[in-house]
């Protein structure tokens, strides 16, 4: 008996061939001997089966002695043995229909788990193997689970169902809802305008939800909500914003915040959360602000940074085109009695300058 695997919702074509290459009478029945489909001349005839409006054939093939049974919009319960009767002979085909679906939704938040469930006909014992977009393989029986979804899990999952040495392939598009970056650092000189951007790693037609930016300033004892906003069909509207600092927010995606001035009291780290409509859980992105200030007070030239810096960052003071006068893994450096000229304060990581502030020291008479 020939075995054919089908996918729920798809179309399958079961073949039946006569030795005579001409249009002759045929009919297809199910295992209960209920007539599904046959022919009379150039026309199709249909029996009282459940497949009535989903069964078809190809009249163009009849005169070649081919009498296929086409079943559209396959259902699991279409799994059965189908019998083609033609020229006093019977051809049997066993059809097994499988379905593979994602647990709730194919749009999942980063960190959530994905469960794929296999629907299969009674008596079958299939095995399933799925390959994620990043090439990770998972195997299982009726259910497959992947915990802690990552951004790289977004894309097409290819799942192969094996039964009777035959296989059928499913493709499921999974969208992991997340920000493009989990964390970002903005380095600014005191007084500069600060731009915070929170690009999303996915695109959906309609995006609705609400969000908030909480800020923990380095100098403050507790965190504070800087701004709350709503998102409706990709349009952003501010609900509430603090007086200090007075943040501005872009009206369109990607989420964009502007801080008029970088000041030492704002240096710190923030957490932007976005709650999407009809989703449990929130999207998070951490953002950090490092502020630099270079000052000269009497005979003391000082360079300071505020905010979350890594211990391996180097802070240096140097006269233009000269070697660094002072260079330390600290958040403040100074030079006493600096000579006249253009001094540079540099914050660098392994030789790469992250932030630079220039200050002119005038000659003392």
């Amino acid at each position: 008996k020939k075995v054919v695997l089908g996918k729920k919702g798809d179309t399958v074509e079961l073949t039946c061939t006569a030795s005579q290459k001409k249009s002759i009478q045929f009919h297809w029945k199910n295992s209960n001997q209920i007539k599904i489909l046959g022919n009379q001349g150039s026309f199709l005839t249909k029996g009282p089966s459940k497949l009535n409006d989903r069964a078809d054939s190809r009249r163009s093939l009849w005169d070649q002695g081919n009498f296929p049974l086409i079943i559209k919009n396959l259902k699991i319960e279409d799994s059965d043995t189908y019998i083609c009767e033609v020229e006093d002979q019977k051809e049997e085909v066993q059809l097994l229909v499988f379905g593979l679906t994602a647990n709730s939704d194919t749009h999942l938040l980063q960190g959530q788990s994905l469960t794929l469930t296999l629907e299969s006909p009674p008596g079958s014992s299939p095995s399933v193997q799925c390959r994620s977009p990043r090439g990770k393989n998972i195997q299982g029986g009726k259910t497959l689970s992947v915990s802690q979804l990552e951004l790289q899990d977004s894309g097409t999952w290819t799942c192969t169902v094996l039964q009777n040495q035959k296989k059928v392939e499913f493709k499921i598009d999974i969208v992991v809802l997340a920000f493009q970056k989990a964390s970002s650092i903005v380095y600014k000189k005191e007084g500069e305008q600060v731009e915070f951007s929170f690009p999303l790693a996915f695109t959906v037609e309609k995006l609705t939800g609400s969000g908030e930016l909480w800020w923990q300033a380095e100098r403050a004892s507790s965190s504070k909500s800087w701004i709350t906003f709503d998102l409706k069909n990709k349009e952003v509207s501010v609900k509430r914003v603090t007086q200090d600092p007075k943040l501005q927010m872009g009206k369109k995606l990607p989420l964009h915040l502007t801080l008029p001035q970088a000041l030492p009291q704002y240096a710190g780290s923030g957490n932007l959360t976005l709650a999407l409509e009809a989703k449990t859980g929130k999207l998070h992105q951490e953002v950090n602000l490092v502020v630099m200030r270079a000052t000269q007070l009497q005979k003391n030239l000082t360079c300071e940074v505020w905010g979350p810096t890594s211990p391996k960052l180097m802070l240096s003071l140097k006269l233009e085109n000269k070697e660094a006068k002072v260079s330390k893994r600290e958040k403040a450096v100074w030079v006493l009695n600096p000579e006249a000229g253009m001094w540079q304060c540099l914050l660098s990581d392994s030789g790469q300058v992250l932030l630079e502030s220039n200050i002119k020291v005038l000659p003392t008479w």
């Epitope: 150039s42 026309f43 249909k46 409006d53 989903r54 078809d56 009249r59 163009s60």
Partner: antibody, heavy 121, light 108 residues
Framework: QVQLVQSGAEVKKPGASVKVSCKAS????????INWVRQATGQGLEWMGW????????GSTQKFQGRVTMTRNTSISTAYMELSSLRSEDTAVYYC??????????????WGKGTTVTVSS | EIVMTQSPATLSLSPGERATLSCRAS???????LSWYQQKPGQAPRLLIY???TRATGIPARFRGSGSGTDFTLTISSLQPEDFAVYYC?????????FGGGTKVEIK
Amino acid sequence: QVQLVQSGAEVKKPGASVKVSCKASGYTFTSYDINWVRQATGQGLEWMGWVNPNSGNTGSTQKFQGRVTMTRNTSISTAYMELSSLRSEDTAVYYCARGVLKGDYYYMDVWGKGTTVTVSS
Amino acid sequence: EIVMTQSPATLSLSPGERATLSCRASQSISSTYLSWYQQKPGQAPRLLIYGSSTRATGIPARFRGSGSGTDFTLTISSLQPEDFAVYYCQQDDHLPLTFGGGTKVEIK
């Protein structure tokens, strides 16, 4: 050109039979079905059945089974439809139409002008 | 048997207007098996469309067929004087072949 020429109008009494002919020309008669469709005055079209001129195989709707006979004479490229046990509701125009099977498509592309059959006592 | 229902029964329009005729099948059929015919008073029907959307030989482009499943449509983009007639849809998904009751397109 391709055409189907039908026999003339008939007036019949209830219980009688009528035989309508349909002569094909301009194409190979045995390559296409001949379908029979009727239309009562002011009413819609009603398909009755068909004959395959090549094999002689026929088929008709359940409504007419036992009362309708569809035949053909290939030597004169003519198809016939005979309806017996006539009743007044069989009063209608009877059309023959060529049935074309092109790939998976089937359609009636050439029609006769129709034969009026009146059943009246 | 599959019952074909056409609507509206009558459509009153002026030349140049767009006509939209509907045909609904009592069960889902493949678009392969849907034809449209035109019939003028005292004449035999004439094939317009087969396979739901393929125009028959010599049929002007203003006639357009569409649809799938149970709902099919014949659209005449700009009615010409010669288009005022009765239009029938017909299925050959399986025996018996059945016609719709027809839609009469008349001059307003």
